[in-house]
């Protein structure tokens, strides 16, 4: 649902040599660049696979959906997809799989209709906190982004360079508050271990919110209280070992909100009181019924809903596997 | 990389103010709550309050309320913690300091001497 | 506010050994409690946070752990240039607050 898709009809394949002989001019009306398929009909262009190195410079200016996944793009420059004239309809992007490495500030300007973006599976060691807003201003003009998807964008650990991986993906997200239209972000599968303070107050439109398969250990300075549009949370196979009275309240207070916890080592002591009683009588926790505690390990499988206040004493030792994620 | 750069050390009388600056370099400015701390020579920390600078948003330590207060200026990313009736108790190094984890400072200042002398 | 008692305030160590402080909170802090080294004349640096994880760049002989009420700091063989005060800080619940500090020195 959040990647571009094609009504695939009738696309035809160029011949290899007609790239290079009109790059340096704008694009016919129904050329197609080497190495892809075109469908002026369902406004699509596929570049898959295709082992690119760079994005193609003569793409059709009719471009609504494109594909360019499973290349080998390495690094996208500032103004990757200005064109003249501009690629003005370009609505959904999708460069998932190429073995991007850096984005650079600026790198998606002159897309006035960008509402898709995809760059899950690719290891971002650098990715500029201007790579979305465009320009380093405090107050930036706003994206027209309404979905970005950043999945398992998590660079192996000896090409993150010496950084927090959290604070780059946060400060790109944040910049020049040009992301406040955002509605969709999906960040799993990102070793996430925290989330700045605050942090999602500053993305006031979001519907839906996927961290699931992260570290995150704690919850207790992520604040929900501003996100009152917010449908989904998924939280699955993260680290979380209680949610606190703070949390519970406010995902309580969220009009249309439905939450994913399954997979947490949720550790069944006296902490986990407010959240068991809690859980008894939300609706919002989706399979609720699944969730069970890790830990102590008399309680290892227990369902948290069959548990009552005499099952949860303190204080466990916690085993060394708890201890970091 | 990551920076705070601070102002230089104040010889202050008694019962005078004092405003420290603190600019920041290197992240998004906006994204980080700045907090600031209190070490008095020889002794352990203490937190005085911190500072969300996409909105200005405050929240102190109760001992420091009335005593410190705290700005930011977005436009030059810099944050500010004004000392006011200063006292030789408020002699120390001030430090600000870039919040990661939260609540957790991940990069510091390099500290402003503070000394309240008559 | 909730106090943190750090023990011990002094530790006398030789290269090589195995050094752990201890970190007691007045009340349950969860896992929200950070670590810091600071070497003299230098400011506080950020060592491990929710009590476990060790910050980005950090050597891994500085080892966290605890939940609750206790916690505990160790590093698991000493160097040189380990010789610092250590401190504990609860992040759990404001006012912020800080362990008085363990400071190590060479025998």
């Known amino acids: 649902s959040s990647s571009p898709t094609s009504s695939a009809s009738s696309f035809s394949s160029s011949a290899p040599f007609l790239a290079s002989a009109v790059s340096a001019q704008p694009p016919l009306p129904d050329q197609c660049p080497a190495l892809c398929e075109c469908s002026e009909a369902a406004r699509t262009v596929k570049c898959v696979n295709r082992n690119l190195t760079e994005v193609p410079t003569d793409l059709p200016a009719y471009v609504r959906n494109l594909f360019l996944t499973g290349n080998q793009l390495a690094v996208l420059p500032a103004g990757a997809f200005a064109r003249r004239p501009p690629l003005a309809e370009l609505a959904a992007l999708n460069l998932s799989g190429s073995r991007l490495d850096e984005v650079r500030a600026g790198a998606f300007e002159h897309l006035p209709s960008l509402r898709q973006l995809d760059l899950s599976h690719n290891p971002l060691a650098d990715l500029s906190p201007f790579a979305f807003s465009g320009s380093n201003a405090s107050v930036s003009a706003p994206s027209p982004l309404v979905e970005l998807i950043l999945n398992h964008i998590v660079p192996p650990e000896d090409e993150r360079q010496n950084r927090s991986f959290e604070g780059m993906v946060v400060a790109a997200l944040l910049a020049g508050r040009a992301l406040q239209g955002l509605r969709r972000l999906e960040l799993a599968s990102n070793h996430f271990l925290y989330l700045p303070r605050d942090v999602l107050a500053q993305l006031p439109s979001l519907r839906h919110l996927d961290l699931s398969n992260n570290s995150l250990v704690s919850l207790t300075y992520v604040s929900f209280r501003n996100l009152t549009h917010l449908e989904s949370l998924h939280l699955e196979d993260n680290a979380l070992k209680v949610l606190h009275n703070g949390t519970l309240a406010e995902l309580q207070g969220l009009p249309h909100i439905r939450v994913f916890l399954d997979n947490n080592p949720w550790v069944c002591d006296c902490h986990m009181a407010d959240m068991v009683t809690w859980l008894k009588e939300t609706e919002v926790v989706q399979g609720k019924d699944r969730l069970t505690c890790a830990y102590p390990e008399k309680m290892r499988n227990r369902v948290l809903l069959e548990l009552n206040s005499a099952d949860l004493d303190c204080d466990p030792i916690l085993p060394p596997s708890l201890q970091t994620s | 990389q990551v920076q705070l750069q601070q102002s230089g050390p104040e010889l202050v009388k008694p019962g005078a103010s004092v405003k420290i600056s603190c600019k920041a370099s290197g992240y998004t400015f906006t994204a980080y709550y700045v907090n600031w701390v209190k070490q008095s020579h020889g002794k352990s920390l203490e937190w005085i309050g911190d500072?969300?600078?996409?909105?200005?948003?405050?929240n102190y330590n109760q001992k420091f309320k009335g005593k410190a207060t705290l700005t930011v200026d977005m436009s030059s990313s810099t944050a500010y913690m004004e000392l006011r009736s200063l006292t030789s108790e408020d002699s120390a190094v001030y430090y600000c300091?870039?919040?990661?984890?939260?609540?957790?400072?991940?990069?510091w200042g390099q500290g402003t001497s503070v000394t309240v002398s008559s | 506010s909730i106090v943190l008692t750090q023990t011990p305030k002094f530790l006398l160590v030789s290269a090589g050994d195995r050094v752990p402080i201890t970190c007691k909170a007045s009340q349950s802090v969860s896992n929200n409690v950070a670590w810091y080294q600071q070497k003299p004349g230098q400011s506080p640096k950020l060592l491990i946070y929710?009590?476990?994880n060790p910050y980005t760049g950090v050597p891994d002989r500085f080892t966290g752990s605890g939940y609750g009420t206790d916690f505990t700091f160790t590093i698991t063989t000493v160097q040189a240039e380990d010789l610092a005060v250590y401190f504990c800080q609860q992040v759990y619940s404001s006012p912020f607050t800080f362990g008085g500090g363990t400071k190590l020195e060479m025998k």
């Open positions: 929710y009590a476990s």
């Open positions: 300091a870039k919040e990661g984890p939260p609540g957790a400072m991940d990069y």
């Open positions: 500072i969300n600078p996409n909105n200005g948003g405050t």
